[in-house]
């Protein structure tokens, strides 16, 4: 079962100081960034006891294995269902600690119950404050029974569960008729999977017979023991303040485990530590009772003392719960209560015992869960001890569960069952991640969800160049960091595997799926200059440069042209995708802007060094366009424009700029300058008789500006062919610019 | 789906005697406590009697008191009312209830009772 | 002993809202109560509990047009967009020591 406890601390005359705490004796427990181990969870579960809403309880986290919940303001905030969450994977799970008012009109006379499949469970709330009214029974918040008032037995009210089964499981209440929810009785009701004494998928495995009031778990056949017991049975008591699977954990406080509340995984449920009782824990055991709860009955022979933390304490010569055995009796020494194997090895098991008279090699044999007896291959002989050493058969999955170290003279016969874990080799399920690659490294997350069991040990990474036949590389690192493969060959594929190790001898697993991984292409080194630039418009650029000759192929794809707008804090690229490029035009850039240049080649995704920048100043933009163009023929040749000037001008005009195209003609426009800036009319002459014509014009200041509005207009008559339009401001001939 | 259906009902003299039986489906019967309430010719609801799930404790009201027993057979889910010394006020449909918390939350269609010479 | 007090008929439009009350007797204005509709030629059916804080736990299938609210000693069921099946008689019921107790009934007429 998972090493989880669930602490309340039950001195109630002040809410405030009451806090609950979850413990994990886990590996590995709550780091919640590490991909191995979530967090824990602990909080005030609603769905069944709901309370009045108040303050947010706080949260807090004591190092990786411990969570807080403190912040508690009133009695009513302590009443109802709290859990806490631990354990990673298939192994997650649920603690649950029922709270009951000390005040409620109904408490519970024992809140956890903890009943075999086909048992019948009593549950017995005890009347606190009397109400003449009914009691409604319910189970996980719906209603389940009704008792009258007059029913009460000695002053309790009983509930009788015949033939439970596993969904009888869970939150089981007794309430008056309309009174509080928070003045009901909160019980427990926990139903294991299987009938007394057995475990697994069809009940058909014996359990270990569990000692000091250790619980069978019905899913794998471990005794989860109470607080204050350890060992594969429970045998074996913790020093006085001390619980957890292994007595790790410490009780805080003076008065150790005084007024604590533990709750550990199902099926064992909540009790007090060993020592206590009461329903605040805070009494300590009668002479002759022991254990959590004090619920265990020392009845010590051979003179032994009764100790309410552990039981009975042997004189020396006795040992065994009760000092029943005479320790001529043989007994097995110091056998671990689990050991741990990987699938397919095949381990050495030591078993010790001592005596009166002596065992020997024969003496001592090895049991497997499916009967199988193995007999020791060799032994070692100590003046206070045997050690017989087994070579157990290569380990298969079968073989998990209580194997048996048992020794027999004629002084009698001592047995230890102990646990034994076939564990399977994690296989990665994923290929490795690629995070980033250079020409001759690749940076690979490892870090893959896998089948088998962890933990993980040790994380190799495998790689070859692709369809090569050649050794594979292997690299050994860290399971949470990121690995850096070295020393590759530029644009190679690679093909890259994971295998994971999990502790102990054959704890490597296969290797996992491959995955293509290709290096990137090598850095072009050439660093291009700029050979000059001229401007073609108030947005326009056109750009050259040069390479270094040197001999062999050109290592680049293309060229990076780079604009740095410093005032606006904006850069433009411009991809010139051709390696014989040496020239380019940028367009669309930002009129009258002060650019900085550069030019650098470029490779696959590599950049190259970059040119020595050049600082560019682009001519400002033009005017806004001319107002009220308008077309008026004057003869077959001319035709008169007229306009007003453009409004909100930056500068004074230098100049107009008239465009002509014949209508629905093919040819290119005619630009014909209006040097006079002054003026708002023009003529133009030199037209072809009855032909349409279309007329826009711009102004001009340090650069052209925008066109004006198109007119159309046609000239008159049937005249004579002319040579092609000119223009008159008034009475000036004007030159015209195509 | 929870299911009540009454029956026994019919024409009796005063001072005759009836039994009404309810028969419980859709739930578990033997969880739930279980009430006779009447209905006379045009009138209101009243109430008769309760039992509880074990069948251990039994209220009436006063103007049944002593001549109606309620009982019930968990078994055969299954609610009675013995009716004994009818008198013509005793004429009403009668409805079997399921009480939950205080309150009916399922009724059946009623069978009627009707005392008269 | 609680006493009920229900006003004997009520009228509304189809469509239209109605809120009915139920008074509960001085000294029992902390009770709950519920409420049953009895449709004519038919058995009574549980609508829903009303608490004294205006919380109400509805029957199955009751629907939405049907809530419950509280004011002091009163409470009251109001039906939304009446129906023609909502035309029945409208009962609250409330419990006590060793017995139920109804009041008078409301007859709610659709019009």
């Known amino acids: 079962a998972v090493d989880l406890t669930l602490l309340a601390n039950l001195r109630l005359t002040d809410p405030q100081r009451f806090f609950l705490t979850c413990v994990s004796g886990e590996a590995g427990a709550g780091r919640g960034s590490d991909a191995w181990g979530p967090p824990l969870l602990l909080e005030k579960d609603d769905r069944i006891v709901r309370t009045p809403p108040g303050p947010p309880l706080r949260l807090a986290r004591n190092g990786s294995h411990q969570v807080t919940l403190r912040g508690f303001s009133k009695p009513s905030d302590l009443v109802g269902v709290f859990s806490c969450v631990g354990g990673a994977g298939a192994r997650r799970t649920r603690v649950i600690y029922v709270h009951n008012s000390p005040g409620a009109h109904l408490l519970p006379d024992k809140v956890t119950h903890t009943v075999n499949k086909g048992d019948t469970a009593v549950l017995s709330a005890r009347v606190h404050k009397e109400k003449q009214t009914d009691v409604i029974w319910k189970s996980n918040g719906s209603y389940f029974y009704t008792l009258d008032w007059h029913e009460a037995q000695d002053g309790r009210f009983l509930l009788q569960l015949p033939n439970v089964q596993p969904p009888s499981s869970g939150i089981y209440s007794a309430t008056y008729l309309e009174a509080s929810p928070l003045g009901s009785a909160f019980f427990r009701l926990i139903v294991r999977g299987c009938g007394a004494g057995r475990w697994g998928p069809g009940c058909t495995k014996e359990c270990p017979g569990c000692l000091h009031g250790g619980v069978c778990h019905d899913h794998d056949g471990e005794c989860v023991c109470p607080p204050g017991f350890t060992g594969t049975r429970c045998e074996q008591a913790c020093r006085e303040g001390r619980f957890g699977q292994s007595c790790q954990e410490q009780c805080p406080g003076i008065s150790g485990c005084r007024g604590l509340t533990f709750c550990l995984p199902d099926p064992y449920g909540c009790s007090c530590g060993s020592g206590w009782r009461g329903s605040q824990c805070q009494e300590a055991c009668a002479p002759g009772h022991f254990g959590a709860d004090c619920r265990l009955q020392c009845q010590c022979q051979n003179g032994g003392t009764c100790d309410r933390f552990s039981g009975c304490v042997c004189p020396s010569g006795w040992h065994g719960v009760h000092c029943e055995k005479s320790d001529r009796i043989p007994q097995i020494l110091n056998m671990a209560s689990e050991l741990e194997f990987n699938l397919e090895t095949m381990p050495r098991i030591n078993c010790a015992a001592a005596g009166n008279p002596f065992p020997v090699r024969g003496s001592i044999e090895l049991r497997k869960p499916d009967g199988t007896v193995l007999l020791s291959t060799k032994a070692i002989v100590e003046p206070e001890k045997t050690t017989a050493e087994f070579e157990v058969p290569r380990l298969v999955l079968a073989d998990s569960g209580f194997w048996e170290c048992r020794v027999s003279t004629s002084g009698g016969q001592d047995s230890r069952r102990f646990k034994v874990n076939v564990k399977v080799p994690p296989v990665p399920l994923a290929a490795p991640r690629l995070l980033t690659k250079q020409s001759r490294q690749l940076v690979v997350s490892p870090l893959v969800s896998f089948s088998g069991d962890g933990p993980i040990s040790t994380v190799r990474l495998h790689y070859r160049p692709q369809d090569s036949t050649m050794d594979w590389s292997t690299i050994v690192v860290d399971p949470s960091e990121n690995v850096t493969l070295m020393n590759l060959r530029p644009k190679t594929g690679y093909s890259v595997r994971v295998q994971l190790s999990r502790p102990g001898e054959g704890g490597e697993g296969a290797w996992g799926p491959p995955t293509l991984m290709t290096t990137d292409c090598p850095e072009p080194l050439l660093q291009p200059w700029l050979e000059g630039w001229h401007v073609e418009g108030t947005d326009r650029l056109r750009v050259s440069w040069s390479l270094p000759l040197v001999p062999g192929p050109l290592v680049g794809d293309g060229f990076l042209l780079r604009l740095w707008d410093g005032t606006r804090g904006q850069e433009r690229r411009e991809n010139v995708s051709s390696p014989q490029a040496r020239t380019a035009l940028l367009t669309g850039l930002t009129p009258g802007t002060h650019y900085q240049l550069d030019v650098q080649l470029y490779h696959c995704t590599l950049l190259g060094p970059a040119s020595p920048p050049a600082h560019v100043l682009l001519p400002p933009s033009g005017p806004p366009a001319p107002r009220h163009l308008h077309a008026q023929a004057l003869s077959d040749s001319e035709i008169q424009l007229t306009w007003k000037h453009p409004e909100a001008l930056p500068g004074p005009i230098s100049k107009y700029v008239v465009e002509v195209q014949v209508a629905g003609g093919a040819g290119d426009p005619l630009w014909i300058d209006v040097d006079r800036p002054e003026e708002t009319s023009t003529i133009i002459r030199g037209l072809n008789a009855s032909t349409r014509y279309l007329f826009r014009m711009r102004a001009s200041i340090q650069g052209l500006g925008d066109w004006s509005n198109t007119v159309e207009e046609s000239t008159l008559g049937n005249g004579l062919q002319a040579e092609g339009p000119v223009q008159e401001s008034r009475a000036a001939e004007e030159g015209l610019d195509q | 789906e929870v299911q009540l259906l009454e029956s026994g009902g019919g024409l009796v003299q005063p001072g005759g005697s009836l039994r009404l039986s309810c028969a419980a489906s859709?739930?578990?019967?033997?969880?739930?406590?279980m009430s006779w309430v009447r209905q006379a010719p045009g009138k209101g609801l009243e109430w008769v009697s309760y039992?509880?799930?074990?069948?251990?404790?039994?209220e009436y009201a006063d103007s049944v008191k002593g001549r109606f027993t309620i009982s019930r057979d968990n078994s055969k889910n299954t609610l009675y009312l013995q009716m004994n010394s009818l008198r013509a006020e005793d004429t009403a449909v009668y409805y079997c209830?399921?009480?939950?918390?205080?309150?009916?939350?399922?009724w059946g269609q009623g069978t009627l009772v009707t005392v008269s010479s | 002993q609680s006493a009920l007090t229900q006003s004997p008929s009520a009228s509304a439009s189809l469509g239209a809202s109605v809120k009915l009350t139920c008074s509960l007797s001085?000294?029992?204005?902390?009770?709950?109560i519920a409420w049953h509709q009895q449709q004519p030629e038919k058995g009574p059916q549980y609508l829903m509990k009303?608490?004294?804080?205006?919380?109400?736990t509805k029957g199955d299938g009751i629907p939405d047009r049907f809530s419950g609210s509280s004011s002091g000693a009163e409470r009251y069921l109001t039906i939304s967009s009446l129906q023609s099946e909502d035309e029945a008689d409208y009962y609250c019921?409330?419990?006590?020591?060793?017995?139920?107790?109804f009041g008078g009934g409301t007859k709610l007429t659709v019009l």
């Open positions: 209830a399921r009480e939950r918390e205080g309150t009916p939350d399922y």
């Open positions: 859709g739930f578990t019967f033997s969880r739930y406590k």
């Open positions: 039992i509880y799930p074990s069948g251990g404790h039994t």
């Open positions: 001085s000294g029992h204005s902390s009770y709950a």
């Open positions: 009303v608490n004294s804080d205006g919380s109400h």
């Open positions: 019921q409330t419990w006590g020591t060793g017995s139920w107790v």
